[in-house]
């Protein structure tokens, strides 16, 4: 997290806000509800209280405007910048302005007013942008779904550094962003994508360029908003310029940032039995056109060329790949070796000699 220079913060815990005007995109009641919920995000974890005023001057004046709207920080039409807010202080201090050239909603369509307001009110209270891609105060807008919003841990640490903790946090579960060098780190899925490596963990992925040691961390939904927050497995089909992503009983085919029409499909369409609830890992072999799909302690082999499951499958993981354990969390292939991830460990397995060559920490793929 980051606070503003000179640690700008309110010197009182009881703050007022006023909704000066409304967007035509939502009902007054929806707007009021979005702002009330956005303030509650911050009051739940601090001693701060927010009271709405209907007239007069409030600490935090909230308004909708377009282009030049009176503060010498003009908005820029649709998309681009969504809103802005001023750090704590007199006059404009704390005020939040929303660009009414955007389409504001209480869903995933357009821009979600609650989510943008929660971010902007973080500025109103003294938080600057965070470098943590999982933080609400990260500068990128990413709608993360309809489920109950949980303030990430980074934002909690930031706001409590200014105002201290509240009496009782009604939602004490605050998601932490994974630390790539945590020795207990396990991974969800790994795939290549156009020469880069994508390493998925929780609602994030690391993107590793072949010539770089420093992997960049992103929210999965910031690249593919239509995908679920978390994924189970992934593989690339390079000759078709596609990657396949699995979650539960569904899978998606992606070309770059675009989901192919007709997806998601059911994994049963690949020929997997109905009782298979999820794929835990997947890896494609371009030279043979075959894909291994792992689930529980079993492995299936799919023929990507003829679109059928190979006979004699499923087989037991332990029989086909002795020594790697009876489950696979993530897997990828490179230069004749398969890398199997099982908890915090990875096994380098030689296809040629059919045996484990090396055992390494899972996060050595991230240069830890």
């Amino acid at each position: 997290y980051n606070v503003f220079p000179r640690t700008l913060k309110w010197s009182k815990m009881n703050l007022t806000y006023r909704i000066v005007n409304y967007t035509p995109d939502m009902t007054h009641s929806e707007v009021e509800k979005a702002f009330k919920k956005a303030f509650k995000v911050w009051s739940d974890v601090t001693p701060l209280n927010f009271t709405r005023l209907h007239d007069g001057i409030a600490d935090i004046m909230i308004s909708f405007g377009i282009k030049e709207h009176g503060d010498f920080y003009p908005f820029d039409g649709p998309s681009g910048l969504l809103a802005h807010a001023f750090p704590p202080g007199p006059n404009y201090g704390g005020d939040a302005h929303f660009d009414d050239d955007e389409t504001w909603t209480s869903s995933s369509k357009g821009y979600n007013l609650f989510l943008v307001a929660a971010h902007e009110f973080g500025h109103s209270l003294g938080l600057d942008h965070s470098k943590d891609p999982g933080a609400l105060m990260f500068p990128i807008y990413t709608y993360t779904g309809k489920s109950h919003f949980m303030l990430p841990d980074d934002d909690v640490q930031g706001i409590q550094s200014l105002y201290g903790p509240g009496d009782e946090d009604p939602n004490p579960k605050h998601p932490k962003t994974p630390d790539k060098c945590d020795p207990s780190l396990s991974l969800d899925a790994i795939t290549s994508l156009r020469g880069e490596t994508m390493i998925f963990k929780d609602r994030f992925f690391w993107r590793l360029h072949p010539q770089q040691v420093d992997a960049e961390l992103f929210l999965t939904k910031s690249f593919w908003p239509e995908l679920p927050n978390r994924i189970d497995a992934a593989y690339e089909h390079p000759s078709h310029d596609l990657i396949f992503i699995f979650r539960g009983r569904k899978f998606w085919a992606l070309n770059g940032y675009d989901i192919l029409e007709g997806y998601p499909k059911k994994i049963s369409e690949l020929g997997l039995p109905k009782e298979v609830k999820k794929i835990s890992a997947a890896v494609h072999f371009e030279d043979t056109g075959k894909t291994l799909l792992f689930s529980g302690n079993q492995v299936w082999r799919y023929d990507d060329t003829n679109h059928i499951m190979d006979k004699d499958y499923p087989r037991l993981i332990e029989e086909d790949f002795p020594g790697i354990g009876d489950k696979v969390d993530a897997v990828y292939e490179k230069n004749g070796y398969i890398y199997f991830f099982n908890g915090p460990i990875q096994f380098e397995y030689s296809i040629w000699s059919n045996r484990i060559v090396r055992v390494m920490p899972a996060n050595s793929i991230l240069w830890c």
Partner: nanobody, 126 residues
């Protein structure tokens, strides 16, 4: 997918001008932020300027404010960087980049741009 091709680089004397072009192809750009970046030999890549494709709003690094102008021509799917009063310290490979993501209240300055061109070399020397 998106392809970006830069052109217009070359050798110019201090105080001179150059106009770089970035031709974009491959998809609709209405929600993109387009940026110019540069990388001098042995240095980190740094932000130069950005433009909101749909509105034309512009943002600049302090080091180029008043000297460089970013603009775009929607009909040609091209972004330009007009560079005036060039200095030896402006010598670098200049890259065009596109970012499809949306920012709450500030424009990005490097990490996270989705697409990059190959770069064009600008040398400022007498």
């Amino acid at each position: 997918d998106v392809q970006l091709v830069e052109s217009g680089g070359g050798l110019v004397q201090p105080g001179g001008s150059l106009r770089l072009s970035c031709a974009a192809s491959g998809r609709t750009f209405s929600r993109y932020v387009m940026g110019w970046f540069r990388q001098a030999p042995g240095k980190e890549r740094e932000f130069v300027a950005a433009i909101n494709w749909s509105s034309g709003s512009t943002y600049y690094a302090d080091s180029v404010k008043g000297r460089f102008t970013i603009s775009r021509d929607n009909s040609k799917n091209t972004v330009y960087l007009q560079m005036n009063s060039l200095r030896p310290e402006d010598t670098a490979v200049y890259y065009c980049a596109a970012d499809r993501r949306v920012y709450y209240d500030t424009y990005p300055n490097l990490r996270g741009y989705d697409y990059w061109g190959q770069g064009t070399l600008v040398t400022v020397s007498s």
